[in-house]
């Protein structure tokens, strides 16, 4: 078990052209908060998915009012750590999502709007019990700068927050086979008490006699890497043999628990174990109450009057989830024509449209000959929202400017020969054969099929096709 | 502004049929897409049945052969015929359109959203 802190340095717009518009006015003070996410290995998950490490929102910065004509400041902050506590082992890998939100202090009706103004993401490597990592990721034209840690809470120390530290019994030494608890040497590392044989590198326990795997391992003993691929057997627990983990319709499937809780079977459904802060079936209940303002985009709170009942998120059309944090799939409806690619941007649905087309839903089919020529007395021609030429006699490629080989497509039938000309192409046709492509044989008696060969030409002399 | 009015929900039982409509009114050029979005209990809202932006119908798996869209464009209207209807059609319905207006601007609407209970 252990902490995870994050400590925001600065919020505000970042180096270069283009500074971010004040996210407050005169008219419209604000106050910013910050909520993170954290996903354990190197996942690149959607915002929405859970945050099975953890979330925590931070308190409100103090309010702030844009001051006329001068640039967008860092805003201010709210004051101390954003900490999510972990009850596992900490996975040494994570993911991370750091949404900056405004919270905005005009006269709104039902109270105060939200609204998200950057988000940042990454994935780090990070051991628990190290010193503070400083990092800055930006958003748009907005920077953030923090620093993050993890560390562990007694009596748990390592990179993983799993190996258990007790005060020394004698002031001198540890006793046998038990080495100092680093950095706490005035402590000793505790007794194993684990299962025999579970792997020190890639197991924990946290009760005697039990052996949970980090994420990535499998067995009875943690010793069998997770496969994903060859998984053939029935549902059931991981084969020690092959290390597969089967997905299939487990009570825990999908991860019932909210809030980074975990999920255990039990013989007739499931139960989830909660981060501290969060209790419920599901852990869906927290000690926010409604006065921390936990619904977002205009979500209307009911109830959580006191730390110990539950709030509930009303939300506003467009917004679902259980602090309204996430938005509906408008782009589900398709709304984008001709093939474009929708966008939704919170603010409002965007369509990225096709070659050929334009306009907000990309509804304007472009006029594709407008400006564009084609070379060599070539003719433009309109269709499906792309420009076509079509090319004189002995051109080719996208706009006529290639010498097209004439021969190219064999053009020359029953074994003729192909010679390219100025004006098109000549065909040498094979004994027996006549005609400008060598289409007609020759009949044996000298006769041949109609056409008859143009005056002045024998069946076999070259034919020019103009 | 924009206002979209649904209404024909209630409770019905296993097997019957319900007939939703969508009137959209206020300060449209057009409408560009047009739909019934669901929202079961505890669960997330999704599409059932719409118009979209190329005029094609779309439809979610579970109600294909079951639930039928239909509009008056005159009326900015749509309608959702469901038959057949199941236990797990149970959800607040809700209209969404995605509307170009007067001044060209493209905007999406939601209504407000209308219960269907399907319960023996």
């Known amino acids: 078990a252990g902490v995870f802190e994050l400590q925001i340095h600065s919020f505000g717009p970042g180096p270069g052209p283009g500074a971010p518009r004040s996210p407050c006015s005169a008219r419209l003070p604000c106050r910013l908060f910050f909520r993170v996410c954290l996903k354990p290995g190197l996942s690149e998950e959607a915002a929405e998915s859970p945050c099975a490490l953890g979330a925590a929102l931070s308190a409100r910065g103090p309010v702030y009012t844009e001051q006329p004509g001068a640039p967008a400041p860092d805003l201010p902050l709210p004051d101390g750590l954003l900490q999510v506590p972990f009850r596992d082992a900490w996975p040494g890998t994570f993911s991370f999502i750091i949404e900056t939100w405004r919270e905005e202090l005009g006269d709104q009706i039902g109270g105060p709007a939200w609204s998200l103004l950057a988000r940042v993401a990454g994935r780090r490597r990070l051991a628990a019990g190290g010193p503070w990592a400083r990092d800055i990721q930006r958003a748009g034209a907005w920077e953030l700068r923090f620093s993050y840690r993890a560390r562990c809470e007694p009596p748990a120390v390592g990179t993983a927050c799993t190996r258990l530290c007790r005060p020394r019994s004698a002031p001198s030494r540890c006793g046998p086979g038990l080495r100092p608890c680093a950095p706490l040497e005035d402590e000793c590392e505790a007794p194993l008490v684990c299962r025999a044989g579970c792997s020190p590198e890639h197991g924990f326990c946290e009760q005697p006699g039990e052996c949970r795997c980090l994420e990535g391992w499998t067995g009875p003993l943690c010793t069998v890497p997770v496969s994903t691929s060859s998984c053939l057997s029935p549902r059931g627990p991981s084969s020690a043999t092959t290390g597969c983990l089967v997905p299939g319709p487990g009570p825990c499937d999908g991860n019932p628990c909210a809030n980074g809780g975990s999920c255990s079977e039990t013989p007739r459904s499931f139960e989830c174990t909660c981060p501290r802060g969060f209790y419920g079936l599901r852990c869906e209940v927290s000690g926010v109450t409604c006065a921390d303002g936990p619904c977002f985009n205009g979500g209307l709170c009911v109830g959580g009057a006191d730390p110990d009942s539950a709030y509930i998120c009303h939300c506003p059309p467009g917004f679902q989830g259980s602090n309204c944090e996430k938005r509906v799939d408008r782009c589900s409806l398709q709304p984008c024509r001709n093939g474009g690619l929708c966008l939704d941007l919170g603010h409002a649905l965007r369509c990225r449209c096709r070659a050929g087309f334009a306009g907000p839903r990309c509804e304007h089919d472009l006029d594709d000959c407008a400006g564009r020529a084609c070379a060599n007395g070539g003719t433009c021609v309109e269709g499906g929202g792309a420009h076509r030429c079509s090319c004189a006699l002995g051109f080719g490629g996208r706009d006529c400017r290639e010498r097209a080989d004439p021969c190219a497509a064999r053009p020359c039938a029953h074994g003729g020969r192909c010679y390219a000309h100025f004006s098109g192409l000549v065909c040498a046709c094979a004994p027996g054969y006549m005609g400008a492509r060598c289409e007609f044989p020759v009949h044996p008696d000298g006769a041949s099929a109609l056409p008859a060969a143009p005056p002045g030409l024998r069946p076999g002399d070259p034919q020019r096709y103009l | 502004e924009v206002q979209l009015v649904e209404s024909g929900g209630g409770e019905v039982q296993p097997g019957g049929s319900l007939r939703l409509s969508c009137a959209a009114s206020?300060?449209?050029?057009?409408?560009?897409?047009m739909g019934w979005y669901r929202q079961p209990p505890g669960k997330q809202r999704e599409l059932v049945a719409g118009?979209?932006?190329?005029?094609?119908?779309k439809y979610a798996e579970s109600v294909k052969g079951r639930f039928t869209i239909s509009r008056d464009n005159a009326k900015n209207t749509v309608y959702l015929q469901m038959s057949s209807l199941r236990a797990e059609d149970t959800a607040v319905y809700y209209c969404?359109?995605?509307?170009?207006?007067?001044?060209?601007?493209?905007?999406?609407?939601w209504g407000q959203g209308t219960l269907v209970t399907v319960k023996p």
């Open positions: 118009f979209t932006g190329d005029g094609s119908t």
């Open positions: 206020g300060s449209i050029f057009s409408i560009n897409a």
């Open positions: 969404a359109a995605d509307v170009q207006l007067l001044n060209s601007d493209y905007e999406f609407y």
